[in-house]
Structures are given as C-alpha cells and as structure tokens.
C-alpha cells in the first residue's frame, strides 16, 4: 500500500463569544485538512479526533466519525470544528481578549489532529501537530492557507 497523506492546512475560521460573569471565552475553531489517497483503491476516513491546547492545557476536543471515503489517487478537503473554552483559571486571558485598547488579540494554540483511515480491514492513524495564532478578540475568517504563515512553530515530523 502507498501512503495516505494528511496535511493540516490551517484555521479556516474562529468564532468567539464571552461570558463576562464567568470570565470565560468560548472559541469555535474550524480547521481545514487535506487528505490525499496515493493508492489505487478507495480508503475510508473513519474518524478524525482533534484537540486544542493553550499553555499546555487542553481547552477543547472534538471527534468526527464515518466522515467520507476517498477514491483512488484522489484528495479530499475536510473541515472540522473544535469548540474550545478558555475558563476562569486563565481569567487573565479574558481581559487580554476583550480589552479594546489592544488592537490584535492573537493567542497561540496548539492544534493536534489524528486521522484514522481504513482499507481492506486495515486501520492506519496519521497525526499532525501545529502551533497557530488565533484571534480571540473578534470573529475571524481566514483565507485558505493564510494561517500557514502565521505558524510560530512547526514541530519536526
């Protein structure tokens, strides 16, 4: 079997809301993946599990099941959303994200994603990690691949 390539493209959008009493930030982060099937047979994308970390704390998790199948030598682009919560233990972040006097409210998040594919009863997992900037001060829609140059660190594969 040839490889199945997973490429994390970046953040597609980040929608933010706040709870002032709880000093809590809610970020719905939509990410984009490219999955390429280099085989001469179809593969199933069984599930995608993702988590987001801020300052080494997991702030969000998501799991998508029975997503799609990818035909031979084909590529599919998949969007997945991770709801994240920056809670009161990090209440200093609430002030940072909501202060009008700060023009750019970018925070660094670590995006982790694992794609599980199956073919002929065989299962394979491919994982990616990427640090990204996300604006926690406003709703933001990024151009596809725009977040690529926002990377502050890309761990060695």
């Amino acid at each position: 079997p040839r490889s199945i390539d997973v490429k994390y493209i970046g953040v597609k959008s980040a929608y933010v809301s706040y709870d002032v009493q709880k000093r809590t930030i809610y970020l719905n982060i939509t990410n984009t993946l490219n999955i390429t099937n280099n085989n001469y047979y179809s593969v199933e994308v069984e599930n995608i599990t993702a988590q987001v970390q801020f300052a080494k704390t997991v702030i969000g998790k998501a799991r998508l099941n029975n997503i799609t199948h990818i035909g031979p030598l084909d590529m599919k682009q998949i969007d997945y959303t991770v709801p994240t919560v920056i809670a009161e233990e990090m209440s200093y972040m609430y002030d940072f994200c909501t202060l009008i006097s700060i023009k750019v409210h970018n925070i660094v998040l670590m995006m982790q994603v694992t794609v599980t594919t199956t073919y002929f009863g065989h299962s394979e997992q491919i994982s990616q990690e990427r640090y990204q900037y996300v604006d926690c001060g406003r709703n933001t829609t990024y151009q596809l691949g725009q977040s690529e140059y926002l990377n502050v660190l890309q761990p060695q594969q």
Partner: antibody
C-alpha cells in the same frame, strides 16, 4: 421591579451553622447570564465578597472561606441560600445578597441586609 | 487574588469641595466598579466599568483610571455624599477595596 430580601437567624453560638436565604423578585435566575452573590460587612470594616451562584448552577467561592461555604438556589421559588459552617465571632456582620445582571460583572441591585451576631 | 487598596481610609471634605478617592490594584485589571454605602443602608452602584455612571447617579460623580490605578471624583461635595465608598473588581477572583469613609467638615 427588582427586589432582594435576606433572612437569617439573627443570633448564633460559636461552632453552629449559619443558614441564610435570599428571596428575590423581578428577575429569574434561570435566565442565561444572571447571577446572585452573597457579600457581608462586619461592623466597622469593609465589604467582603463570599460566594456567587450563576444561572446554570455554577458556583464561585471566596478563596479563604471556601471550605466553610455552600451556596445553592431554588429557581422555582426565586431563592438563593448560603450556608456557613462553624461560625465564630469574626462572622458577626450584616449579610447582603446582590444581583449581577445578565452579562454584567457588577451588582446592580442589593438586598437590605440581615444582621448576624455570633456570641456565646 | 487581587488586593484593592483604597486611600485615604477616612476623608473630611467641605461642602462644594472637589475630592478624589483612589483605588490601587495589586495587579493590572481592566476596570473597577464603585459603590456607595450610606450609614444604615445597603450599598448602591455608583459607577461601573471605571467611568460609567449608574442610573440616577448625579453627574458630580465621575470615575477614571486604568491598569492598577483608579479614582472616583466628586466635583462639588454635597452633604448627602457622606458615606463609605468601595471599589470592586471581578477580573481575577472577586474583591472589594477596604473602603473610604467620607465625612463632612
């Protein structure tokens, strides 16, 4: 019209448990973003925040008093409760409940207060 | 926990005088709120979000500040302003300042 009214025992002996009730009207504690706090004022001293309960039953407590405090609510009867265990003379104070309006972080309405004396 | 230190603890003012009460935070915060408590009464919201006047509060009251330093100014003190004044923050946990007692000369 928003009103809050506190009630309590008035006098307790040291080591007893204090139970306070805040009865309110003019708003619902099931409304998203609402909250009610308990605050006290010992005679001759400043205000001290004790506990807060949110519309979704989430709670916050004063760090230094956390082990002795329990806040709860009965949404259907428009009441919030505060329990303080093992009271001593330093708990002698006027106790207030105050409303924090929807998506606000300040107290826009206060009760009239209920006085507690802890004495043996 | 953030400590709010109010000064002076007691202030005497003459009618018509302009006075400023201060509130200093042990860490930088976004804003503070101010409450007035008259003798025998419950506290009343005076100013929210550092500088916004609460409903029904006379315009002689004003608030300002940022970071770790905040102040409440009464432009022309009236007899009915004799009270305790408290600053309050909800940014990092929740605390009130120790209060300033305003007396009339």
């Amino acid at each position: 019209q928003v009103t809050l009214k506190e009630s309590g025992p008035g006098i307790l002996q040291p080591s007893q448990t204090l139970s306070l009730t805040c009865s309110f009207s003019g708003f619902s504690l099931s409304t998203s973003g609402m909250g009610v706090s308990w605050i006290r004022k010992p005679s001759g001293k400043g205000l001290e925040w004790l506990a807060h309960i949110f519309w979704d039953d989430d709670k916050r407590y004063n760090l230094f008093l956390k082990s002795r405090l329990t806040v709860s609510k009965d949404t259907s009867s428009n009441q919030v409760f505060l329990m303080i265990t093992s009271v001593d003379t330093t708990d002698t104070a006027t106790y207030y409940c105050a409303r924090m309006g929807r998506q606000r972080d300040y107290f826009d309405y206060w009760g009239q207060g209920t006085s507690l004396t802890v004495s043996s | 926990q953030i400590i709010l230190t109010q000064s002076p603890a007691i202030m005497s003012a003459s009618l018509g005088e302009e006075i400023t009460l201060t509130c200093s935070a042990s860490l930088s915060i976004s804003y503070v709120h101010w409450y007035q408590q008259k003798s025998g009464a419950s506290p009343k919201l005076l100013i929210y979000g550092t500088s916004n006047l609460a409903s029904g509060v006379p315009s002689r009251f004003s608030g300002s500040g940022s970071g770790t330093f905040y102040s409440l100014t009464i432009s022309s003190v009236e007899a009915e302003d004799a009270a305790d004044y408290y600053c309050h923050q909800w940014s990092i946990y929740r605390t009130f300042g120790g209060g300033t007692k305003l007396e009339m000369k």
